[in-house]
């Protein structure tokens, strides 16, 4: 028989999305046991039929990768999990409506920080996503978000920071003291979607000035 409350077997069914990798996760409820099995289905918003996700039927783990199945940026999706306990009790719970553009979070960028004598160069590498273009290439975050820009900060001392920002990939902080340590932080910002990545941080030291030796 079905439990009085589905949350006895199943809780917190939701998408967790980062850089467009879309993972469905859930928790077992208080009456869930290690031998409870879970089956996952998904559908596009507006469609009637649910589709069973291959590789996520009668599984015991509490996550399922739906990146490929939810990879169309212009579509909205639902997923649902059905839990069946060893005793034959079952419960089904559905996610809220999911939009990868809206809900994905941004990981810190991949950055190379290069020390020079009186400057520090920062080169941001475009972030790939699992989404494929028509020509088979993987899209980068820059291909998806027109308004994406990088915010760079260099902590010079406790009271002074230098800032740079833009849509370029190469930046340089000039006018620095040789042989001095600095802390750089670089974030990805997408204002139209109110997105901001966690910062990439690099601790770098300018090179000593050998011209006087």
């Amino acid at each position: 028989h079905a439990p009085e409350d589905p949350s006895d077997l199943l809780q917190h069914v939701k998408f967790q999305s980062s850089n467009f990798e879309n993972i469905l996760t859930w928790d077992s409820g208080p009456e869930g046991t290690p031998d409870t099995v879970y089956s996952i289905e998904y559908k596009t918003y507006g469609e009637r039929d649910w589709v069973a996700k291959k590789g996520c039927q009668r599984i015991t783990r509490k996550s399922c990768n739906l990146t490929v199945e939810t990879g169309n940026l212009t579509e909205l999706y639902y997923a649902r999990v059905t839990a069946v306990s060893a005793g034959g009790r079952s419960a089904t719970k559905m996610t809220d409506r999911f939009s990868s553009l809206q809900h994905t979070t941004l990981k810190p960028p991949d950055v190379t920080c290069i020390s020079k004598v009186r400057s520090i160069q920062m080169i941001v590498h475009p972030t790939p996503t699992p989404i494929r273009a028509g020509d088979g290439h993987r899209l980068t975050l820059e291909d998806i978000f027109h308004d994406l820009f990088y915010h760079l900060e260099l902590q010079v001392n406790r009271t002074y920071q230098m800032h740079l920002g833009g849509k370029q990939r190469e930046y340089e902080f000039f006018g620095l003291t040789p042989d001095t340590e600095f802390l750089g932080t670089i974030m990805i910002c997408v204002p139209t979607w109110a997105k901001e990545s966690a910062p990439y941080m690099c601790r770098v030291k300018t090179l000593p000035d050998r011209t006087w030796t």
């Epitope: 940026l73 989404i131 273009a133 028509g134 020509d135 290439h137 899209l139 291909d143 998806i144 027109h146 308004d147 820009f149 915010h151 800032h163 740079l164 920002g165 833009g166 849509k167 370029q168 990939r169 190469e170 910002c189 204002p191 139209t192």
Partner: antibody
């Protein structure tokens, strides 16, 4: 050398259609943001539309939504703007432009579109 | 949409004058502002990006600065070839929007 060459402008009646083209060379067209920008006679500049040539993602200014369609032919390195239901206020010089290394620094010479009866 | 209010709409300058043009954004746009120069019958030409960074090949008499949501383009000593219309552009969010333009004429 980056080159953008627009064509397809002309005189059209209100309610009519026109298709602008922009032939691009000198950069990797198939992974870029491409723009249409217009300038009405004696007026300022206005961004009309943008497309990412790899993802196909597009954006439009509100005044042209539902009437204009931006597209590309990546095999021919060409950007298009299909303009339907044209109004007199669409009269302008239309420029194509591209973003290279983060900067909108390359523009075509422009093509004149006149909407008049 | 983000509004860019540019002033003055026109100004008269003598050769060698210091000229200042300002743009006020209707909301925060970080440093995502560019300045363009346009001469009659030509496409715009990028002068400054990132509010204060000089584009390659642009004379050093052009400079840009930012204070909050207010941005300034300065020409430290106007030359004859600088007589043109100048536009600011916010590159923060779509739709990208220009200021109304400032026409710099000879006094």
């Amino acid at each position: 050398e980056v080159q953008l060459v627009e064509s397809g402008g002309g005189l059209v009646q209100p309610g009519g259609s026109l298709r602008l083209s922009c032939a691009a060379s000198g950069f990797t067209f198939s992974s870029s943001w491409m723009y249409w920008v217009r300038q009405a006679p004696g007026k300022g500049l206005e961004f009309v539309s943008v497309i990412n040539t790899r993802s196909g993602i597009t954006h439009y200014v509100e005044s042209v939504k539902g009437r204009f369609t931006i597209s590309t032919d990546n095999a021919k390195n060409t950007l298009f703007l299909q303009m339907n239901s044209l109004k007199s206020e669409d009269t302008a010089v239309y420029y194509c432009a591209t973003r290279i290394q983060g900067l909108i620094d390359y523009w075509g010479q422009g093509t004149q579109v006149t909407v008049s009866s | 949409d983000i509004q860019m209010t540019q002033s003055p709409s026109s100004l008269s300058a003598s050769l060698g004058d210091r000229v200042t043009i300002t743009c006020q954004a209707s909301q925060s746009i970080s440093s995502m502002l560019a300045w363009y120069q346009q001469k009659p019958g030509q496409a715009p030409n990028l002068l400054i990006y990132g509010a204060s960074r000089l584009q390659t090949g642009v004379p050093s008499r052009f400079s840009g600065s930012r204070s909050g949501t207010s941005f300034t383009l300065t020409i430290s000593g106007v030359e004859a070839e600088d007589l043109a219309t100048y536009y600011c552009l916010q590159d923060y969010s779509w739709p990208l929007t220009f200021g109304q333009g400032t026409k710099v004429e000879l006094k």
